[in-house]
């Protein structure tokens, strides 16, 4: 079952999934000046059996100007490096080390893909939030959101992360702010 809405937005924060539940779709979007190849699928789909999950279909972009040339989908090393994101939280680091059953990993980039990935999430998906660079967590409550089905409707739980740009915390004597997690994701993810 697809989630009706996008995950909640948190001001000055971005969200990321560490793994994608089977049934998740990723739009094959191309950057400006490029388009999906005519025979290409409009999306990638996370599918699998009991033992293994993977993305079905491949996204391919071609120059809007050049009609008959299609580019190979092998990402350049610098592109791969550019898209590598910082770990978001200890849960994410843990999830990154083990393959979650019934989940796909982040799909590798394809050449000339759009800067923002548009996912269509399914019920049971969890996304994790982190303050962007230059902002700190005023309050670090549960910093994740889960798409749940209640009364026949899907809804995302509300993350309790508050990010602020205020530099001087109203700290009290003898209190220390917990260590901040690494700042920022280079790019945000969006669902539609």
């Amino acid at each position: 079952e697809l989630c009706d809405d996008d995950p909640p937005k948190i001001t000055h924060a971005t969200f990321k999934a560490v793994a994608y539940k089977e049934g998740t779709m990723l739009n094959c979007e191309c950057k400006r000046g490029f388009r999906r190849i005519k025979s290409g699928s409009p999306y990638m789909l996370c599918t699998g059996n009991s033992s293994h999950s993977s993305w079905d279909n491949q996204c391919q972009c071609t120059s809007s100007a050049a009609r008959n040339t299609t580019k190979q989908v092998t990402p350049q090393p610098e592109e791969q490096k550019e898209r590598k994101t910082t770990e978001m939280q200890s849960q994410m680091q843990l999830a990154d080390q083990v393959s979650l059953p019934g989940h796909c990993r982040e799909p590798p980039p394809w050449e000339n893909e759009a800067t923002e990935r548009i996912y269509h999430f399914v019920v049971g998906q969890t996304v994790y939030y982190q303050c962007v660079q230059g902002y700190r967590a005023l309050h670090r409550g549960p910093a994740e959101s889960v798409c749940k089905m209640t009364h026949g409707k899907t809804r995302w739980t509300q993350p309790q992360l508050i990010c602020t740009g205020e530099t001087e915390p109203s700290q009290f004597p003898g209190e220390e702010e917990p260590q901040a997690s690494p700042d920022g994701l280079p790019e945000s993810e969006t669902s539609r």
Epitope: P8, T11, H12, H139, R140, Q158, Q160, Q171, F172, P178
Partner: antibody
Framework: QVQLVQSGAEVKKPGASVKVSCKAS????????MHWVRQAPGQGLEWMGV????????IYAQKFQGRVTMTRDTSTSTVYMELSSLRSEDTAVYYC????????WGQGTTVTVSS | DIQMTQSPSSLSASVGDRVTITCRAS??????LEWYQQKPGKAPKLLVY???TLAEGVPSRFSGSGSGTDFTLTISSLQPEDFGTYYC?????????FGQGTKLEIK
């Protein structure tokens, strides 16, 4: 079930201070930040500030900067709001409200400032 | 600071009526908006969060819509218990501010 129970009504003289408490129960206290909102008689709602129950860090509305202090005691799951140098315009009902979306509110504490 | 302006400031409607209250933000606040209902002598109650998500236990006759600067709270079929004052509020960034309120009376 989630409950936010506030301390009782207070009558104060101008220039004095008042400390209002908000005791939380029915959920993990440090998961949700706590906001303070006040409402003068016959008026609308006014946001005063927010405190992280996790770190104790707080942000205050400019209007109350220097006069308000928000603290928390994790051992009793209680948040406090102290307002100093009281004036008659501070006569209001003071509410605590939970989390990003203010999903639960305390019952309110009436503070009357009168000479 | 972001200003929130509600309209109308008061209205009177009959049971069964469709009622619409609007809220305008002085700048783009995306969907960081809540609606509350307050009855005399009581604390406000959350109705809608993130512009359109109905809070738990809130009747389905209430709905929220809008994004950016213009938002709407709609009561599809007014019930006697729906009287009170309605407030919008943003949580885009501190300071969080409220609209001035809309007083809804039942005819």
């Amino acid at each position: 079930q989630v409950q936010l129970v506030q301390s009782g009504a207070e009558v104060k003289k101008p220039g004095a201070s008042v400390k209002v408490s908000c005791k939380a129960s029915g959920y993990t206290f440090t998961d949700y930040a706590m906001h303070w909102v006040r409402q003068a008689p016959g008026q609308g709602l006014e946001w005063m500030g927010v405190i992280s129950t996790y770190s104790g860090d707080a942000i205050y509305a400019q209007k109350f900067q220097g006069r308000v202090t928000m603290t928390r005691d994790t051992s009793t799951s209680t948040v406090y709001m102290e307002l100093s140098s009281l004036r008659s315009e501070d006569t209001a009902v003071y509410y605590c409200a939970r989390g990003v979306t203010f999903d639960y509110w305390g019952q309110g504490t009436t503070v009357t400032v009168s000479s | 600071d972001i200003q929130m302006t509600q309209s109308p400031s008061s209205l009177s409607a009959s049971v069964g009526d469709r009622v619409t209250i609007t809220c305008r933000a002085s700048q783009d606040i995306s969907n960081y908006l809540e609606w509350y209902q307050q009855k005399p002598g009581k604390a406000p109650k959350l109705l809608v969060y993130n512009a359109k998500t109905l809070a738990e236990g809130v009747p389905s006759r209430f709905s929220g819509s809008g994004s950016g600067t213009d938002f709407t709270l709609t009561i599809s079929s007014l019930q006697p218990e729906d009287f009170g004052t309605y407030y919008c509020q943003h949580h885009y960034d501190t300071p969080y501010t409220f609209g001035q309120g809309t007083k809804l009376e039942i005819k």
